[in-house]
């Protein structure tokens, strides 16, 4: 069957979560097949492990992807020491990774 | 270190066939998925088809599903495409890359070369 390559979306966490103290960064990668594929947390270009969760979807009733989200979970205080957040993602079908990111505060 | 070569590309008219290959050597294949890329002039480079592990199967972009066929050799650490139906817009270099690791992960630490396929009459 035929590769298709994930579309990567990252989202900050919300004003409404930053009130309850916790900070959750999502990196979103939508309509790819095969399943495999590796999701990477850099924080001010510093590589993340052990402090995120991914969740994968099971295949699409009408394309047969996978959607998966990977969830950086910090305390708002974590948060707020760094700016630049980024996610780097590989799958079989991209040549090269893709990374998505945002500047803290200016989104 | 880990070395790629690819060969087999040339000249071909639309509706001929090429057989392309890709000897490695320093890194024993099998235990890592092989896939060809192709560049066109001015454009991105862009997957064509991976051949996983034994036993794990092939998967293709939707342009080549049907006409393209990836296999492997284990055993003479080579990866082969053989292009049927070739169209000129098939007209690219094409690169074959080894996976960093057995997770199937995408993320392609070694490449060749590339050899140029060419499709016209």
């Known amino acids: 069957r035929t590769v298709a390559a994930p579309s990567v979306f990252i989202f900050p966490p919300s004003d409404e979560q930053l009130k309850s103290g916790t900070a959750s960064v999502v990196c979103l990668l939508n309509n790819f097949y095969p399943r495999e594929a590796k999701v990477q947390w850099k924080v001010d270009n510093a590589l993340q492990s052990g402090n995120s969760q991914e969740s994968v979807t099971e295949q699409d009733s009408k394309d047969s992807t996978y959607s998966l989200s990977s969830t950086l979970t910090l305390s708002k205080a974590d948060y707020e020491k760094h700016k630049v957040y980024a996610c780097e993602v590989t799958h079989q079908g991209l040549s090269s990774p893709v990374t998505k990111s945002f500047n803290r505060g200016e989104c | 270190q880990v070395q790629l070569q690819e060969s087999g590309g040339g000249l071909v008219q639309p509706g001929g066939s090429l057989r392309l290959s890709c000897a490695a050597s320093?890194?024993?294949?099998?235990?890592?998925?092989m896939s060809w890329f192709r560049q066109a002039p001015g454009k991105e480079r862009e997957f064509v088809a991976v051949?996983?592990?034994?036993?794990?199967?092939?998967f293709y972009a939707d342009s080549v599903q049907g006409r393209f066929t990836v296999s492997r050799d284990d055993a003479k650490n080579t990866v082969y495409l053989q292009m049927n139906s070739l169209k000129p817009e098939d007209t690219a270099v094409y690169y074959c890359?080894?996976?960093?690791?057995?997770?199937?992960?995408?993320?392609?630490?070694?490449w060749g070369q590339g050899t140029q396929v060419t499709v016209s009459s």
């Open positions: 051949a996983r592990r034994s036993g794990d199967g092939a």
């Open positions: 320093g890194r024993t294949i099998s235990r890592y998925a």
């Open positions: 890359a080894i996976d960093s690791d057995t997770f199937y992960s995408g993320s392609y630490d070694y």
